[in-house]
Amino acid sequence: REAAPKSYAIRDSRQMVWVLSGNSLIAAPLSRSIKPVTLHLIACRDTEFSDKEKGNMVYLGIKGKDLCLFCAEIQGKPTLQLKEKNIMDLYVEKKAQKPFLFFHNKEGSTSVFQSVSYPGWFIATSTTSGQPIFLTKERGITNNTNFYLDSVE
């Protein structure tokens, strides 16, 4: 039976959700007037870059769009971007597609996503609404790197 990605709404501790704005992901308050993305998550079958201490290796995509999250260096800084790619195309590749890979680790009831390409860099939201989802190596008060994955049908 072919694997299928799991679907989640994603939310942080300040009740900010991820929203698609053009071809970018931004954080916005959970409200009736905005449509949060549904995140597609599927495990990578290739174990080349695996590190159990850091979590399970996963690909992250946007449900209903051929868009996946990936990491690239821009002006010397690891940056989170969306790339036109079907998550299942990544899944069926025999070799792990490193820029698209994240370590998914559970911390209590929250999830943390660390870039496989750039160890120590985590997906984060700012404390300010309307800002892009980004990568940070500063985990703490000013950046939120812990997310709730809410099951959606």
Partner: antibody, heavy 122, light 112 residues
Framework: ELQLQESGPGLVKPSETLSLTCTVS??????????WGWIRQPPGKGLEWIGS???????YYNPSLKSRVTISVDTSKNQFSLKLSSVTAADTAVYYC??????????????WGQGTLVTVSS | ESVLTQPPSVSGAPGQRVTISCTGS?????????VHWYQQLPGTAPKLLIY???NRPSGVPDRFSGSKSGTSASLAITGLQAEDEADYYC???????????FGGGTKLTVLG
């Protein structure tokens, strides 16, 4: 139909711990995307949010009460509870439990218990 | 003092239209979190009247409507009836407090 019912002592002595339970019927306390809250109303005054717990077990507390509040869930009894320590007369109020769903009521509370009056007095 | 500010009281004659304001800040209403309104009849628990700024739960008459702009929101009641006499509360979420916040409440008196 989802219903909530508060229970607990109506009289608590100063400096003691107030303990209340909210029993959920007509639905599961572990239902996805659900949050459960405690709100109080001192006599003749307005509503004050005390704290919440959600289906993941995450707790959120009013900063002004945080040092004294604990909210927990008992899934086997389909209940959630409030503990408020070191109470004073200022904690005398009607205590309500309430609930909502993240992606349906958008951080509002659509079902409330009837409320229970707790008096702090020696 | 409440995080959200409401007038303590408003009044109107039967059949009239009244509005109740709710003023917040850039960390709650102004941050685009939704505003919800509750009606509390004397001696009863609050009841959700408006959710998500302008949506009525089933069973709430269309005489009640909500709106939001900037850091403020308002509840409008048209065709005022004696049974509308109650306390009304607005509520939102505040990211700086990581919690839910209420207005101080507004007592609506139906005259006559």
């Amino acid at each position: 139909e989802l219903q909530l019912q508060e229970s607990g002592p109506g009289l608590v002595k100063p400096s003691e711990t107030l303990s209340l339970t909210c029993t959920v019927s007509g639905g599961s306390i572990t239902a996805s995307n659900t949050y459960w809250g405690w709100i109080r109303q001192p006599p003749g005054k307005g509503l004050e949010w005390i704290g919440s717990i959600d289906y993941t077990g995450s707790t959120y507390y009013n900063p002004s009460l945080k040092s004294r509040v604990t909210i927990s869930v008992d899934t086997s009894k389909n209940q959630f509870s409030l503990k408020l320590s070191s109470v004073t007369a200022a904690d005398t109020a009607v205590y309500y439990c309430a609930t909502g769903k993240y992606y349906e009521t958008y951080l509002g509370f659509d079902v409330w218990g009837q409320g229970t009056l707790v008096t702090v007095s020696s | 003092e409440s995080v959200l500010t409401q007038p303590p009281s408003v009044s109107g004659a039967p059949g009239q239209r009244v509005t109740i304001s709710c003023t917040g800040s850039s960390s709650n209403i102004g941050a685009h979190y939704d505003v919800h309104w509750y009606q509390q009849l004397p001696g009863t628990a609050p009841k959700l009247l408006i959710y998500g700024n302008d949506n009525r739960p089933s069973g709430v008459p269309d005489r009640f409507s909500g709106s939001k702009s900037g850091t403020s929101a308002s509840l409008a009641i048209t065709g005022l009836q004696a049974e509308d006499e109650a306390d009304y509360y607005c509520q939102s979420y505040d990211y700086s407090l990581s919690g839910y916040v209420f207005g101080g409440g507004t007592k609506l008196t139906v005259l006559g």
